[in-house]
């Protein structure tokens, strides 16, 4: 059931409500979007305007870089994941326009709304590879200095995407479209229907390892690095750790809507007034995450900005400065024993 | 009182068309919608379609989408059927049911208040 | 489609006894503004189906407070609380939440 001959009729959506006006032809259309739907509709456009330029930018920009540069490549696979999400924004925005209803077809709503978890899974994983190469850079740069290369990294990428495309299958297999017979619309959603039990066990897996894993693993880490950093008194520029941690700091704050009421969601009987209430905010809370997309980008210039002092040089040229820095166990050609302590303190700044 | 008064029994040829009637009386004919089921002997209901009298829009279920036609006579309050191409399965009753678009604390056109008697149909050669 | 499940297929009954009728959806009827359009008809022989249960759990006009409807999601059920002799036929589940709407396969209440 791909595509549904799906024409809208000469009568209305009447809002979600289980009321008609009666005095009111029934043949008439109802044009009012609940005002979660606008916001998600204005942050959707801000997103996707942001999201597309910034990321097209960043991964112009990181492209080159990542053939001898790890940062480079780091940044780069972030940005493909939020300039692909971006992607499903134009559908995602004109679905809501058209009050929820869905006129792409079956594939399509498998596909484009998967997308963001898709995002979520990548970033968080690609996230976690980016900490644990901070940490290594920082506790164990003799091990950075003779393992530390573009092809691990790539395999890192790899196992990252493949990981997180594996985690988004459930959400992906469950995606139906379901035309409702009155008010007359195609919906695209998740249909659990008999399997409430899986239904939770997605939630709580999408949340704990989407989340809360993520988010107690990766405090835990940049507590050690910042720890570190600070009681060495770096002498070196922290722009990409602190870059880093802005990055992670953001994930977790734009994802903790989405996070919340999907858990109480799966809990709550979807007949529930609390559900219903849920479900009005669910645009909004995907919208709120999808900021994820573009603010990364943003991250990167104000970073840039702060270093240079003002914005001095052209975007690109600022962006490079930002994403392409390189750690310092890469720029030693030679490393000795002796060079061991001064490098334990050098790192402290990545 | 409302009642929903079908037209008799038909015997039609495999290949061949029908037009069943079901003529309205006792309520405002534009102000409810008209759906059409089928009921093969012995066996359970089946959704044909609708049709809204008051606009001509109809909605069809994609199994009888291209074999069905629904249309309304406002002036004689009558909704019709016509089926084509026939076959041996379309051999069933077939009724007209009227939806109330507001019933109680209910609003919406949801279920079928009233029935039509139902016409025979047999396809038989 | 969906695709409604009644069971059991046959209840055979005596009069005064309590009867109960279950309707398992394929997919969930809950409509996005949060109702089930879950409706039970009854058929009595040679006749027209008839209203009993619209939207779960309301009785329409004129039917007996014997008969109750409950139910949500995918799991509707049908009591009658004292069988009469009126409420012989085969009673149907139907559902208008998704096209095409469809119907149960039927229940027979019959007498033992």
């Known amino acids: 059931m791909d595509s549904f001959n799906y024409t809208t009729p000469d009568y209305g959506h009447y809002d979600d409500k289980d009321t008609l006006d009666l005095n009111t032809p029934v043949d008439k259309t109802s044009n009012t979007l609940r005002v979660p739907d606008i916001l998600a509709l204005v942050i959707f456009a801000v997103v996707f305007l942001v999201g597309v330029l910034g990321n097209a930018l960043v991964v112009w920009v990181t492209a080159f870089e990542a053939k001898r540069t790890i940062n480079a490549i780091w940044f780069l696979n972030l940005a493909v994941a939020d300039f692909l999400s971006c992607l499903a924004l134009p559908i995602l925005f004109t679905s809501i326009v058209q009050h929820h209803h869905w006129p792409f077809g079956g594939a399509a709503c498998s596909i484009l709304p998967s997308l963001i978890l898709l995002n979520m899974y990548a970033s968080i994983l690609l996230l976690a590879t980016i900490s644990a190469d901070r940490f290594l850079l920082v506790f164990k740069p003799i091990w950075c200095q003779n393992f530390r290369g573009a092809g691990l990294a790539w395999i890192a990428c790899a196992v990252a995407w493949g990981l997180a495309l594996l985690l988004t299958i459930p959400s992906f297999l469950y995606r139906v479209v379901r035309e409702e017979y009155f008010p007359p619309k195609v919906l695209c959603g998740v249909d659990y229907s008999h399997d409430k039990r899986r239904e939770r066990a997605v939630a709580i897996v999408r949340l704990v390892l989407g989340f809360l894993w993520p988010l107690l693993t990766l405090t835990i880490c940049y507590t050690f690095i910042l720890l570190r950093t600070w009681s060495r008194r770096a002498t070196r520029s922290t722009k990409t750790l602190k870059v880093v941690v802005a990055v992670v700091a953001s994930f977790f704050i734009f994802w903790l809507p989405y996070q919340v009421t999907g858990i109480m969601m799966s809990f709550l009987e979807p007949s529930s007034p609390t559900f219903l209430l849920l479900k009005k905010l669910d645009s909004l809370c995907v919208s709120f995450a999808y900021i994820n997309c573009c603010i990364n980008p943003i991250i990167y210039v104000v970073a840039g900005q702060g270093f240079q002092g003002r914005l001095r040089k052209s975007l690109p040229s600022l962006l490079r400065n930002v994403l392409t820095e390189e750690s310092v166990v890469r720029e030693s050609k030679s490393f000795t024993r002796s060079t061991v302590d001064t490098m334990a303190q050098k790192t402290q700044a990545v | 009182q409302v009642q929903l008064q079908q037209s008799g029994a038909e015997l039609a040829k495999p290949g061949a068309s029908v037009k069943l009637s079901c003529k309205a009386s006792?309520?405002?004919?534009?102000?409810?919608?008209m759906h059409w089921v089928k009921q093969r002997p012995g066996q359970g209901l089946e959704w044909i379609g609708y049709?809204?009298?008051?606009?001509?829009?109809?909605k069809y279920n994609q199994k009888f989408k291209d074999r069905a036609t629904l249309t309304a006579d406002k002036s004689s309050s009558t909704a019709y059927m016509q089926l084509s191409s026939l076959t041996y399965e379309d051999s069933a009753v077939y009724y007209c049911?009227?939806?109330?678009?507001?019933?109680?604390?209910?609003?919406?056109?949801?279920?079928?208040?009233?029935w039509g008697q139902g016409t025979t149909l047999t396809v038989s050669s | 489609d969906v695709v409604m499940t009644q069971t059991p297929l046959s209840l055979p009954v005596s009069l005064g006894d309590h009867a109960s009728i279950s309707c398992r959806s394929s997919?969930?009827?809950?409509?996005?503004?949060?109702?089930?359009?879950l409706h039970w008809y009854l058929q009595k022989p040679g006749q027209s189906p008839q209203l009993l249960i619209y939207k779960v759990s309301n009785r329409f006009s004129g039917v007996p407070d014997r008969f109750s409807g409950s139910g949500s999601g995918t799991d509707f059920t049908l009591k009658i609380s004292r069988v009469e002799a009126e409420d012989l036929g085969v009673y149907f589940c139907?559902?208008?939440?998704?096209?095409?709407?469809?119907f149960g396969s039927g229940t027979k209440l019959e007498l033992r």
């Open positions: 997919q969930s009827l809950i409509h996005s503004n949060g109702n089930n359009y």
């Open positions: 049709i809204n009298p008051s606009s001509g829009y109809t």
């Open positions: 006792g309520y405002t004919f534009t102000s409810y919608w």
């Open positions: 049911a009227r939806v109330p678009l507001s019933y109680g604390s209910s609003y919406g056109p949801y279920f079928f208040d009233y």
């Open positions: 139907s559902q208008s939440t998704l096209v095409p709407l469809t």
